[in-house]
Amino acid sequence: HTTVDTSGLLQHVKFQSSNFENILTWDGGPASTSDTVYSVEYKKYGERKWLAKAGCQRITQKFCNLTMETRNHTEFYYAKVTAVSAGGPPVTKMTDRFSSLQHTTIKPPDVTCIPKVRSIQMLVHPTLTPVLSEDGHQLTLEEIFHDLFYRLELHVNHTYQMHLEGKQREYEFLGLTPDTEFLGSITILTPILSKESAPYVCRVKTLPDRTWAYS
């Protein structure tokens, strides 16, 4: 998602999107200086008029949050950055066509790992996004991707692995040894758009078996 670098003032204008938080980023070229300022505009695909992004006019930082301006995940957008340096002409570069649905990456899920004596329970919490429903609710990833599922793995000493996967949010690995440390990893996948998050990792120890003490 990067434009071609043909200027020494501005390069690599691109969207970086994660969980539908859409940040426009760019680099200053070799000709840029500390007094180079940048202005950001954006538009929906198919529209002619560019809109100036308030808060991202004549700024010195090399990023601009366009999440709210590009929040319709079914639409395509463009953004452009204009760089101005003292005494020089402005240089403008535009992004490739951007779709948050296609281009967003998925962050690791938020998971609670609960040890028991002979099992480990994993509770996946819904991941909120900045995308809003018609009634103003923040949508979760599950409400956007019909095919979203979770892949869970449990590792013991790098030798033995157990696997679970599903569209549920609650899982339990059964038949484990008490008082033993396990490494769990939980990943989000959406097959149709080929998205896969980095794993959430939890290190958890099953509880000691106290029953012998009372027998």
Partner: antibody, heavy 117, light 107 residues
Framework: EVQLVESGGGLVQPGGSLRLSCAAS????????MYWVRQAPGKGLEFVSV????????HYVESVKGRFTISTDNAKNTLFLQMNSLKSEDTAVYYC??????????WGQGTQVTVSS | DIVMTQSPSSLSASLGDRVTITCQAS??????IDWYQQKPGQAPKLLIY???RLETGVPSRFSGTGSGTSFTLTISGVEAEDLATYYC?????????FGQGTKVELK
């Protein structure tokens, strides 16, 4: 207790329209994936369409794209299927179903749609 | 679309028999296969989800195995109430697709 009750089926001529409804209760309707599934006489089951009641995201099977529209009224906990340009091959029992805790395990009793001249 | 090829289309069993139904997916669906039972005039009922996990309240004589593209539903000892049509469903990607169904009848 989860309940899904379909209505709106009937006899319609080819090219005609029909609107099916599914009244839902016993679960959080406003944050769920809801489905229409059909079964032609003596035949197997086919998923027709799905909608997420919160995001409004929809998917359709290819054979009904451009003719059927799935929608909801979240205030009334009701799922709809607007069926236009009906064909004889759309004749079937239409079920609504929902995904709860990751599983499609609740179904209505079905409503019969017959397309015939 | 993912095509689910189910076999046999029908079978005759005596009470107590072990019955096996297979489903082949046209591409990998990982473990995302569910099995439903349908009786005449009724909606389908979920028996097994995620290849092998038994839905609450379903008798333990029902079991499922497989992975990737090849899956099996087994009824270890058929009872009279099991006479019905069984469908596999791939719940991996839209459009979700069923197998053609297997009618289990009494011999």
């Amino acid at each position: 207790e989860v309940q899904l009750v379909e209505s709106g089926g009937g006899l319609v001529q080819p090219g005609g329209s029909l609107r099916l409804s599914c009244a839902a209760s016993g679960f959080t309707f406003s944050s769920s994936w809801m489905y229409w599934v059909r079964q032609a006489p003596g035949k197997g089951l086919e998923f027709v369409s799905v909608i997420n009641t919160r995001s409004g995201i929809t998917h359709y099977v290819e054979s009904v794209k451009g003719r059927f529209t799935i929608s909801t009224d979240n205030a009334k906990n009701t799922l709809f299927l607007q069926m236009n340009s009906l064909k004889s091959e759309d004749t079937a029992v239409y079920y609504c179903a929902t995904r709860i805790q990751g599983l499609i395990d609740y179904w209505g009793q079905g409503t019969q749609v017959t397309v015939s001249s | 679309d993912i095509v689910m090829t189910q076999s046999p289309s029908s079978l005759s069993a005596s009470l107590g028999d072990r019955v096996t139904i297979t489903c082949q997916a046209s591409q990998s669906i990982r473990s995302f296969i569910d099995w439903y039972q349908q009786k005449p005039g009724q909606a389908p009922k979920l028996l097994i989800y995620g290849t092998s996990r038994l839905e609450t309240g379903v008798p333990s004589r029902f079991s499922g195995t497989g992975s990737g593209t090849s899956f099996t539903l087994t009824i270890s000892g058929v009872e009279a109430e099991d006479l019905a049509t069984y469908y596999c469903l791939q719940d991996y990607s839209w459009p979700l697709t069923f197998g053609q169904g297997t009618k289990v009848e009494l011999k």
